[in-house]
C-alpha cells in the first residue's frame, strides 16, 4: 500500500466510541510499540465491510481489552 509507512499507527483519528456487537467479526488489539506509541483496538466487520478503529478510551474498547487479556494470560 503506497501510503503506508512503518512507524505509523494503524488508526487515523481517535476512533469510534462503539460498534454494534452483531457487526463484529473479530477484534484485534495493537499494543504500544516502536511503530505506534498508543494502544489501538481494530474491529474487523462482518460481510467484508472493512475495519474500524475503536476509541481505546471507550467503554466498549475497555471491555474488549479486558476480555482479550483474560483470554491470553
Amino acid at each position: 500500500f503506497p501510503m503506508f509507512k512503518r512507524g505509523r499507527c494503524l488508526c487515523i483519528g481517535p476512533g469510534v466510541k462503539a460498534v454494534k456487537v452483531a457487526d463484529i467479526e473479530k477484534a484485534s488489539i495493537m499494543y504500544p510499540s516502536n511503530n505506534c506509541d498508543k494502544i489501538e483496538v481494530i474491529i474487523t466487520l462482518k460481510e467484508n465491510k472493512g475495519q474500524r478503529c475503536l476509541n481505546p478510551k471507550s467503554k466498549q474498547a475497555r471491555l474488549i481489552i479486558k476480555k482479550v487479556e483474560r483470554k491470553n494470560f
Partner: nanobody, 126 residues
Framework: EVQLVESGGGLVQAGGSLRLSCAAS????????IGWFRQAPGKEREGVSC????????YYADSVKGRFTISSDNAKNTVYLQMNSLKPEDTAVYYC???????????????????WGQGTQVTVSS
Amino acid sequence: EVQLVESGGGLVQAGGSLRLSCAASGFTIDDYAIGWFRQAPGKEREGVSCISSSDGSTYYADSVKGRFTISSDNAKNTVYLQMNSLKPEDTAVYYCAAAQGLVVTEMFVGRSYDYWGQGTQVTVSS
C-alpha cells in the same frame, strides 16, 4: 445537521497554486479523519490526502506527495489542501470527506467515509 463545504477551486495555469478549504459543521473535526478525494471526467474517484486533526498525522497519495500539503485549523473546524506545482492532470472535482474510526489501509476507500461535501472544481490549463 452535518455539513462539509468545499471552496477555493478555480482555473489556474500549470505550475500555479490553489488552496482548497473544507469547512465542517455539525461535528468536530478533532473526532474525525478528513480526507480529500478527486474525480476527473471519465475517471474513478481517487484519494489524494488525509489528516487526523487530533494528532496532526498526515497522509498523501504518491501522485501528489511533495506538491500538496494538508492542514487543519481546529478553531475554525476547517481542513485545507494547499496545492502547488499544479499539473493539467490535477484537473478534477475535489471533494472532502469525514470518517470516524478510519484505518490507514482504508484511508482512500470511499465507503469508509461517513460524510461528503458537494465538491469544488479545479481546472489546470497548460
